[in-house]
């Protein structure tokens, strides 16, 4: 039992549990498709344990293979809304440092308004996560129907 | 090498490994919106290890973050049939104790007959987590099909 | 601190990590719905850390309870294809053993050209995980848009 | 609840057409498939066809060749059933149904009936 | 279309006694964890009125003496204890797809 204890008075981050749930703060401006996110407990259910937010964007702190998922609504759509503002996509992927850029995660949303995945990736110390929303509809920013976070797994 | 084997004798809910995978039992009277659940291996390959059901619904016994996911496909469903009955909504969210209440997990099924999704997002001992499925439609009770679960990530 | 360096220094089998994920390498022949993986650094992200491939399909060597998860992504598709060639069904299953056998996740493309889930099950070593993708339709190989894994959650 | 409100009997010639008319009480007329069955006269059930009032959408058993069209008027939450080329086997009581909660084809509600006799 | 087959065609039973009615259909009528199998009762100059739905739901009103079961294509109505007001013809309804189709009918009697 001794051992159980002596794991819980350990700093977490030495486990490596990193961790981050966040919500939609805004768009960007017209020509830039990326979505900026925010967390804290201030704001209601979103957090980071470990990794940052840079400018909107999610800061990598620890390597590792992560746990990488997001929903997002768009708003006021309806599936024909949808069908007409196709092709409405979402990427999420590596967009700094350069040298690793790459879409980690895409879907369009076709006749749907809500898009939802998840994926396993290795990423590093600095890896900036960004995702991008391309079409002219406007994402929700209801914290339960928008959100985007990542999972420390294992190193 | 000991420790690994000492880690192993530990009780594995000191380790704060709750987790549980429910299949839909039943849904409710006309006037209550909520699935409600069930879980076991007798029942297949469902199970609790932590959280416990109340009544159908999913009680937290262990405080921390937690990753909620769930899959709901509509019975005798077709992309018809889904855009007729639009809207059709899934929401997840804590509905005891009502000081904490909060929807945490919002789809629409729009011109499709399966919501899938899943989020981090911090838990207390005691939340009772609800699914309501709000429509004219009836949920698959097929396993492969609709399923709700949760797993404790980190304190 | 010295505990968790020594945590640090035992190798990550004996803590349970079992993780993969992997892209699609290409269909079956005709007759045949599964669907044929790969994964390595070689090949970009995708990894295999505890399980292995046979023949294209994931064979699990630990057991224990596992989150499963795929996204598929039909290839030069709209939803008028898609709804065009429905039936298209996902199916993620325990192809192997024989006595094993069971549909495990299973989803319609119905109006939409991706879906993606995951699910918390059980699994046992010598588990061969198969996913069966009928109808008319090519998957994408794009590897941001078709992927499945699997991670160990606890035993 | 809901009250299913069906229009008088009527007696029709061979070749004429029939319409029928229910009318449903509460605010729900328009996310409930209304169904159309008739029963012949000491005879079992048929299922003619439905209509989604939402959207107008029909579903028509092929038995009926063409010779059934359903509508709805959503601004007075009412269906109709209109049946052609009438013959004397069209004799028959038909019911408008719907469902209580789920839109599933089974039938909670029924209208009181409407007899229609074909005769020359 | 499905094809729905009840037997017996007529039943006499006693006050008190055991009714069971079974209806076959020509293919399964179950789909998604359910059985779209449905029971209704008709009196002379009255619309059908509905019993059980989905297989073995008793719908809201009727008297706990009526059950139904069964899954695939086999279903069964029982009726626990025949009262003098079950006097009535009974008809099996599947939803599994369109057209929805009914059995012939059974017509219950007092013996």
């Known amino acids: 039992q001794r051992f159980a204890q002596a794991q819980q008075q350990l700093p977490l981050e030495s486990l490596g549990w990193d961790v981050a749930e966040l919500q939609l703060n805004h768009t960007g401006p017209q020509q830039d498709p990326r979505l900026y996110w925010q967390g804290g407990p201030a704001l209601g259910r979103s957090f980071l344990h470990g990794p940052e937010l840079d400018k909107g964007q999610l800061r990598i702190h620890r390597d590792g293979i992560y746990m990488v998922h997001i929903q997002v609504t768009l708003a006021i759509c309806s599936s024909t809304t949808a069908s007409r503002h196709h092709p409405t996509t979402l990427a999420v992927g590596i967009c700094s440092p350069a040298s690793r850029s790459i879409s980690l995660l895409r879907l369009s949303f076709h006749q749907g308004c809500t898009i939802a995945s998840q994926r396993l990736t290795p990423l590093a110390r600095g890896d900036t996560l960004c995702t991008n929303l391309t079409g002219t509809l406007l994402p929700s920013r209801n914290t339960d129907e928008t959100f985007f976070g990542v999972q420390w797994v294992r190193p | 090498q000991r420790f690994a084997q000492a880690q192993q004798q530990l009780p594995l809910e000191s380790l704060g490994w709750d987790v549980a995978e429910l299949q839909l039992n039943h849904t409710g009277p006309q006037q209550d919106p909520r699935l409600y659940w069930q879980g076991g291996p007798a029942l297949g390959r469902s199970f609790l290890h932590g959280p416990e059901l109340d009544k159908g619904q999913l009680r937290i016994h262990r405080d921390g973050i937690y990753m909620v996911h769930i899959q709901v496909t509509l019975a005798i469903c077709s992309s018809t049939t889904a855009s007729r009955h639009h809207p059709t909504t899934l929401a997840v969210g804590i509905c005891s104790p009502a000081s904490r209440s909060i929807s945490l997990l919002r789809l629409s099924f729009h011109q499709g007959c399966t919501i899938a999704s899943q989020r981090l997002t911090p838990l207390a001992r005691g939340d009772t987590l609800c699914t309501n499925l709000t429509g004219t439609l009836l949920p698959s009770r097929n396993t492969d099909e609709t399923f709700f679960g949760v797993q404790w990530v980190r304190p | 601190q010295r505990f968790a360096q020594a945590q640090q220094q035992l190798p990550l089998e004996s803590l349970g990590w079992d993780v993969a994920e992997l892209q699609l390498n290409h269909t079956g022949p005709q007759q045949d719905p599964r669907l044929y993986w790969q994964g390595g650094p070689a090949l970009g992200r995708s990894f295999l850390h505890g399980p292995e491939l046979d023949k294209g399909q994931l064979r699990i060597h630990r057991d224990g309870i596992y989150m499963v998860h795929i996204q598929v992504t039909l290839a030069i598709c709209s939803s008028t294809t898609a709804s065009r060639h429905h039936p298209t069904t996902l199916a993620v299953g325990i192809c192997s053993p024989a006595s094993r056998s069971i549909s495990l996740l299973r989803l319609s493309f119905h109006q939409g050209c991706t879906i993606a889930s995951q699910r918390l099950t059980p699994l046992a070593r010598g588990d061969t995980l198969c996913t069966n993708l009928t109808g008319t339709l090519l998957p994408s190989r794009n590897t941001d848009e078709t992927f499945f894994g699997v991670q160990w959650v606890r035993p | 609840e809901v009250q299913l409100v069906q229009s008088g009997a009527e007696v029709k010639k061979p070749g004429s057409s029939v319409k029928v008319s229910c009318k449903a009480s509460?605010?729900?007329?328009?996310?409930?498939?209304m169904h159309w069955v008739r029963q012949a006269p000491g005879q079992g059930l048929e299922w003619m066809g439905a209509?989604?009032?939402?959207?107008?959408?029909?579903s028509y058993n092929q038995n009926f060749k063409g010779r059934v069209t359903l509508t709805a008027d959503k601004s007075t939450s009412t269906a109709y059933m209109e049946l052609s080329s009438l013959r004397s086997e069209d004799t028959a009581v038909y019911y408008c149904?719907?469902?209580?909660?789920?839109?599933?084809?089974?039938?909670?509600?029924w209208g009181q009936g409407t007899l229609v006799t074909v005769s020359s | 279309d499905i094809v729905m087959t009840q037997s017996p065609d007529s039943l006499a039973v006693s006050l008190g006694e055991r009714a069971t009615i079974n209806c076959r259909a020509s293919?399964?009528?179950?789909?998604?964890?359910?059985?779209?199998m449905h029971w209704y009762q008709q009196k002379p100059g009255q619309p059908p009125k509905l019993l059980i739905y989905?297989?073995?739901n008793l719908e809201s009103g009727v008297p706990d003496r009526f059950s139904g079961s069964g899954s695939g294509t086999d279903f069964t109505l029982t009726i626990s204890s025949l009262q003098a007001e079950d006097v009535a013809v009974y008809y099996c309804?599947?939803?599994?797809?369109?057209?929805?189709?009914f059995g012939q009918g059974t017509k219950l009697e007092i013996k």
């Open positions: 149904a719907r469902n209580s909660y789920y839109d599933y084809a089974w039938f909670t509600y």
């Open positions: 509460g605010d729900t007329f328009p996310r409930y498939n």
């Open positions: 209509i989604f009032p939402g959207n107008g959408e029909t």
């Open positions: 293919k399964s009528v179950s789909s998604s964890g359910y059985s779209f």
């Open positions: 989905l297989a073995s």
């Open positions: 309804q599947h939803s599994r797809e369109f057209p929805p189709t």
